[in-house]
């Protein structure tokens, strides 16, 4: 018979022969032959392979180094890598999450549009007219100016993006 030029799923071509790939969590020890099956071995502790493969070495689990602000989100297994995230108040500096930085605070005049997560930083937005923020915060949104009218008061001092309006009593008309 003609030697194959392509193999089925979960197989690979070697020496004009289709061999079975090793399943996730196992590495290749020896290719199959005309007489023997592919030989695979389980990955060692703290190692993994996450696909059907012909790798001769397993990959090492990622280390979520607490000194870099990292913690484990999902423990590694023989078939999956460890997933790291950041400690509370910190977020990853990259998609691979190899280190963490402190969440950014929004300065006065800016409010939090989106609170930071373990993988994304705080998103700030300028306070629009009618709103203010007088603190630097990683949580506070822009607050609406106080409505003097609803309190039967009048505006004594206009608000800004950093300060609330100041309300005062209405001037009594003298008789």
């Amino acid at each position: 018979p003609e030697p194959p030029t392509a193999c089925r799923e979960k197989q690979y071509l070697i020496n004009s022969q289709c061999c079975s790939l090793c399943q996730p969590g196992q590495k290749l020890v020896s290719d199959c032959t005309e007489f023997t099956e592919t030989e695979c071995l389980p990955c060692g502790e703290s190692e993994f392979l996450d696909t059907w493969n012909r790798e001769t070495h397993c990959h090492q689990h990622k280390y979520c180094d607490p000194n870099l602000g990292l913690r484990v989100q999902q423990k590694g297994t023989s078939e999956t890598d460890t997933i790291c995230t950041c400690e509370e108040g910190w977020h990853c500096t990259s998609e691979a999450c190899e280190s963490c930085v402190l969440h950014r605070s929004c300065s006065p005049g800016f409010g939090v549009k989106q609170i930071a997560t373990g993988v994304s930083d705080t998103i700030c937005e300028p306070c629009p007219v009618g709103f203010f923020s007088n603190v630097s915060s990683a949580f506070e949104k822009c607050h609406p100016w106080t409505s003097c009218e609803t309190k039967d008061l009048v505006v004594q001092q206009a608000g800004t993006n950093k300060t609330d309006v100041v309300c005062g009593p209405q001037d009594r008309l003298r008789a």
Epitope: P24, G25, P42, C43, G44, E45, S46, E47, D50, Q60, H61, Y63, C64, R71, V72, Q73, Q74, K75, G76, T77, S78, E79, T80, D81
Partner: antibody, heavy 119, light 113 residues
Framework: EVQLVESGGGLVKPGGSLRLSCAAS????????MHWVRQAPGKGLEWVAY????????YYADTVKGRFTISRDNAKNSLYLQMNSLRAEDTALYYC????????????WAQGTLVTVSS | DIVMTQSPDSLAVSLGERATMSCKSS????????????LTWHQQKPGQPPKLLIY???TRESGVPDRFSGSGSGTDFTLTISSLQAEDVAVYYC?????????FGGGTKVEIK
């Protein structure tokens, strides 16, 4: 037959130090991750620390971070727990336990060694 | 940290009867990569260290009798002893094996009625 035998427990004053050892036999020690787990008298189980087979990965419970140090010597088939700045709340039976690279669970536990912190 | 909550605290069952205990986790224990739930059950008999009973929610450890079975997924898990034997008197702990810190439930004490 898998065997894990601890030693080093005892009575120590608050603020004192103690070093626990766990001697392994009946399996290839360097192929396994290892844990320390403790159990206060009459209470449940509390995980303390983990060290990977090759010493590369170490994790601690927040309650012991900065005070306890887990280590291993694969040549001596031994696991250690150095405990400093001991507190009354560290009083417990300390178990070493093995973690394999397949189940990723603690599949064998030692008998435990008692640590008592009291003045 | 993942909080593991077991119920009931204790359970008295007649010999040969079924014993069922529950374990709830404060977040999912499902590994997104291999679709296994990393929930482990340990048995601790009086005066003995814990012993691995079940891993990956429902896989019995070698040598564990088939009267022990585990089920559940995500955050809700159950351990069942189909026909209680005298040697099953113990405290049963569920454990989060999904992430660090590893956390245990408070345990369910199984006694003979």
């Amino acid at each position: 037959e898998v065997q894990l035998v601890e030693s080093g427990g005892g009575l120590v004053k608050p603020g004192g130090s103690l070093r626990l050892s766990c001697a392994a036999s009946g399996f290839t020690f360097s192929d396994y991750g290892m844990h320390w787990v403790r159990q206060a008298p009459g209470k449940g189980l509390e995980w303390v620390a983990y060290i990977s087979s090759g010493n590369r990965i170490i994790y601690y419970a927040d309650t012991v971070k900065g005070r306890f140090t887990i280590s291993r010597d694969n040549a001596k088939n031994s696991l250690y727990l150095q405990m400093n700045s001991l507190r009354a709340e560290d009083t417990a039976l300390y178990y070493c336990a093995r973690q394999d690279g397949y189940r990723y669970a603690m599949d064998y536990w030692a008998q435990g060694t008692l640590v008592t912190v009291s003045s | 940290d993942i909080v593991m909550t077991q119920s009931p605290d204790s359970l008295a069952v007649s010999l040969g009867e079924r014993a069922t205990m529950s374990c709830k986790s404060s977040q999912s224990l499902l590994n997104s990569g291999n679709q296994k739930n990393y929930l482990t059950w340990h048995q601790q008999k009086p005066g003995q260290p814990p012993k691995l009973l079940i891993y990956w929610t429902s896989t019995r450890e070698s040598g564990v009798p088939d009267r022990f079975s585990g089920s559940g997924s995500g955050t809700d898990f159950t351990l069942t002893i189909s026909s209680l034997q005298a040697e099953d008197v113990a405290v049963y702990y569920c454990q989060n094996d999904y992430t660090y810190p590893l956390t245990f439930g408070g345990g369910t004490k199984v006694e003979i009625k």
